[in-house]
Amino acid sequence: QLPPGKPEIFKCRSPNKETFTCWWRPGTDGGLPTNYSLTYHREGETLMHECPDYITGGPNSCHFGKQYTSMWRTYIMMVNATNQMGSSFSDELYVDVTYIVQPDPPLELAVEVKQPEDRKPYLWIKWSPPTLIDLKTGWFTLLYEIRLKPEKAAEWEIHFAGQQTEFKILSLHPGQKYLVQVRCKPDHGYWSAWSPATFIQIPSDFTMND
């Protein structure tokens, strides 16, 4: 029987900069029941606070609701693991909410085959940003990535769309049914999950681009 091993806070994520959650990985338990507590203070403060919500984020997590989340202040936090034999602390972790945003997937993915008379045909893909992300404030730049593949293919073809919310693809295999998905990330945040797949049938007379 030993004191607990050192825990590690390894992940913090915010869906929209208004709330965030951090998760820790326990160290060894020393063969005894172990209690974990997360304490934090914000830049410019000395007063330590305990995690406001250990439930919402699941096991070994701390969730900061709206009233506990500030974009203006860096959070300094650590986890304490305690059993009957003693305690151990994680390293201090510094969190700026701006840099942990992982948005929801883009919405309203629409895919259409366009066949202009005077030009090569193309696949036109359009989507909307996730609703929780407020792009009007200006500091939030979302970048998008598209992936597509014929239904039975193993490999995805990836296209980086930058800040655009629509994209054209010229080179496709005629007569194939394609799956199309899109995801997004803030410039210094994390990629969202891929959106649900949209299917599109490419006509047999679709001319491949050279």
């Epitope: 390894f10 410019g44 972790l93 500091w139």
Partner: antibody, heavy 118, light 112 residues
Framework: QVQLVQSGAEVKKPGSSVKVSCKAS????????IHWVRQAPGQGLEWMGE????????NYNQKFKGRVTITADKSTSTAYMELSSLRSEDTAVYYC???????????WGQGTLVTVSS | DVVMTQTPLSLSVTPGQPASISCRSS???????????LHWYLQKPGQSPQLLIY???NRFSGVPDRFSGSGSGTDFTLKISRVEAEDVGVYYC?????????FGGGTKVEIK
């Protein structure tokens, strides 16, 4: 404890490439961005670029765009910085540095001296 | 790119005396999220840089309270209230509001 251990000094010919490694330990490698900063002899610090090891997403200083490639190998917890088309002005100490969930550098490697000379 | 200008270039200080380093940026360092990402690093002789102050005025873990940072917008200052022998080295200001991140040219502090 957090450690960033870099590869050893290199001497390279003009026009060639160099690849510097930065092995991370003491934390979950995929959690935090790794940055590369260089320092020419007797000069200041110059940020080259950064990588998120969780998905290898990169941002580069446009000054080095096309010449620098930053990669990460999750299996060995190692980040790499490759600089191509070397010239004498690239003689410098190259540092890797780690952020938290922030955009400043809390931990630094020991530095790797790259000398470009014919 | 944002140009960071530090003054003075070098500083010779008697132990126990104060020291002050100025840093000016070519454009405002207020991020569109409201934060100011101006930091100070110290590079001791033969060592890698180490973080002293983040976001203008916040001491990093383990940094003695004789170090303090202040300023806003484009003008920033690092003060050492009582210089000690271990404080010798080159001090750099750095901004991470705008990409590419940039550093000042450095201020060399030595002991008289």
């Amino acid at each position: 404890q957090v450690q960033l251990v870099q590869s050893g000094a290199e001497v390279k010919k003009p026009g060639s490439s160099v690849k510097v490694s930065c092995k991370a330990s003491g934390y979950t490698f995929t959690s935090y961005w790794i940055h590369w900063v260089r320092q020419a002899p007797g000069q200041g610090l110059e940020w080259m670029g950064e990588i998120d090891p969780s998905d290898s997403y990169t941002n580069y200083n446009q000054k080095f765009k096309g010449r620098v490639t930053i990669t990460a190998d999750k299996s060995t917890s190692t980040a790499y910085m490759e600089l191509s088309s070397l010239r004498s002005e690239d003689t410098a100490v190259y540092y890797c540095a780690r952020s938290f969930f922030t955009n400043w550098f809390a931990y630094w490697g020991q530095g790797t001296l790259v000398t470009v000379s014919s | 790119d944002v140009v960071m200008t530090q003054t003075p270039l070098s500083l010779s200080v008697t132990p126990g005396q104060p020291a002050s380093i100025s840093c000016r940026s070519s454009q405002s360092l207020v991020h569109s999220n409201g934060n100011t990402y101006l930091h100070w690093y110290l590079q001791k002789p033969g060592q890698s840089p180490q973080l002293l102050i983040y976001k203008v005025s916040n001491r990093f873990s383990g940094v003695p309270d004789r170090f303090s940072g202040s300023g806003s917008g484009t003008d920033f200052t690092l003060k050492i209230s009582r210089v000690e022998a271990e404080d010798v080295g080159v001090y750099y200001c750095s901004q991470s509001t705008h990409v590419p991140f940039t550093f000042g040219g450095g201020t060399k502090v030595e002991i008289k």
